[in-house]
Amino acid sequence: DVERTTCPPEKEVHEIDESLIFYKKRELEACVDAALLAAQMDRVDAIPFTYEQLDVLKHKLDELYPQGYPESVIRHLGHLFLKMSPEDIRKWNVTSLETLKALLKVSKGHEMSAQVATLIDRVVVGRGQLDKDTADTLTAFCPGCLCSLSPERLSSVPPSIIGAVRPQDLDTCGPRQLDVLYPKARLAFQNMSGSEYFVKIRPFLGGAPTEDLKALSQQNVSMDLATFMKLRREAVLPLSVAEVQKLLGPHVEGLKVEEQHSPVRDWILKQRQDDLDTLGLGLQGGIPNGYLILDLSVREALS
């Protein structure tokens, strides 16, 4: 239970204004009414409260809104957003992109990735899906934030908005997120010509299956090493030396540089050494000539 202090009559608060910056923590607790604070939230960000004072104001709002703040309050949080935890944000229902923009601006330059990820998640839930307007807002105000969404949330992305996603927006996406986004991108760009298609699909290829990589290898795409290194290990391993050579084109020489890194290292271990030798790169670690390759995983599955 909170320790109670009576508000001195001369300190009574009838509206939220700059005089509150001179209130001690105890005085704020005793004199600022949470309902009044919520009603006049639009004034709070213009007042230079200390972090300790902001803590008190946050606790006041928590008292008033135990089930989570309404959007009318969230919209005006300003620097008070910096005091919010992911658990606080998880209780919110946010539908307005103006609210999202305002809070993304506040969070810039602060270590708030978990809070921002949760906020974006609440916006997607509130709006029903990650629509084009939301995606545009994210790309404009928070590049890379798209990847903070869970694969489950990303599954609501309509293919039509994939075109608005820029390569840098996907930089921090993990394999599970690209697994969700790649099929949507494939659908979105299906009517494009070979070279144009590859430029568009390239940032999403971390979610591509082996079959699609094989198909790309037939199209003279000259994949750069950075893109190749982001491919799913499981998708790369079944590719033959010839297919990788065609896929990379002139960039195949980069394999030597990445020889010790996954997925290149794992792929080398799966290739016959004499096939690797045809590349003339001096790649080592392939299966020696004359060895028989047994796929034990198949045998285990049968037994």
Partner: antibody, heavy 119, light 108 residues
Framework: EVQLLESGGGLVQPGGSLRLSCAAS????????MSWVRQAPGKGLEWVSN????????NYADSVKGRFTISRDNSKNTLYLQMNSLRAEDTAVYYC????????????WGQGTLVTVSS | EIVLTQSPGTLSLSPGERATLSCRAS???????LAWYQQKPGQAPRLLIY???SRATGIPDRFSGSGSGTDFTLTISRLEPEDFAVYYC?????????FGQGTKVEIK
């Protein structure tokens, strides 16, 4: 079902004291702002006071400031209004009401208890 | 304090007619904190509208609220016999919280 039941009203002489109680049930009282509102016979509604759930921050109408004290006992789900130095103009039906912070309105009211200040 | 002035004081109408009640604030208030109540003789008030335009639980859709800043309106599209009562507006944007003086809607 939300219920608010006021008690403690009655006839009191000017300058006297009275304590009103409001027993709450059907909702999480410990999370909820509560208010007192009064209505003089044949007149309109007048907000008297409210109290926050955790910090018990209080606010009063100027007409009762320094004479009335609102309080709550969260363990008993009960709201109180201690009325001292009563005046004839305090004669009214006193309602206990729940303030819905998500709506900014008083969404549930008790049936009221009549306080008559007269000699 | 914020003074809320309701007009007219009394509205004499017949069932089925439209009622328009006005509430004017002496200072601009946030519409999120403007509510309307209905009170019948011998009963406690009942919340009708909150946030200037949102109907409270169980309130029929013939009741609607609108307005912003200093001017707010409660409209009853078609009066039913049970709608004849006193209506109050209330603001909780500033302390003290204040009510209007009320508008009585009576049968003509």
């Amino acid at each position: 079902e939300v219920q608010l039941l006021e008690s403690g009203g009655g006839l009191v002489q000017p300058g006297g004291s009275l304590r009103l109680s409001c027993a709450a049930s059907g909702f999480t009282f410990t999370n909820t702002y509560m208010s007192w509102v009064r209505q003089a016979p044949g007149k309109g509604l007048e907000w008297v006071s409210n109290i926050s759930p955790t910090y018990s921050t209080t606010n009063y109408a100027d007409s009762v400031k320094g004479r009335f004290t609102i309080s709550r006992d969260n363990s008993k789900n009960t709201l109180y209004l201690q009325m001292n130095s009563l005046r004839a103009e305090d004669t009214a039906v006193y309602y206990c009401a729940r303030y819905n912070s998500y709506q900014g309105g008083l969404d549930y009211w008790g049936q009221g208890t009549l306080v008559t200040v007269s000699s | 304090e914020i003074v809320l002035t309701q007009s007219p004081g009394t509205l004499s109408l017949s069932p089925g007619e439209r009622a328009t009640l006005s509430c004017r604030a002496s200072q601009s208030v946030s519409s999120s904190y403007l509510a309307w109540y209905q009170q019948k003789p011998g009963q406690a008030p009942r919340l009708l509208i909150y946030g200037a335009s949102s109907r409270a639980t169980g309130i029929p859709d013939r009741f609607s609220g609108s307005g912003s800043g200093t001017d707010f309106t409660l409209t009853i599209s078609r009066l039913e016999p049970e709608d004849f009562a006193v209506y109050y507006c209330q603001q909780s944007y500033y302390y003290p919280i204040t009510f209007g003086q009320g508008t009585k809607v009576e049968i003509k």
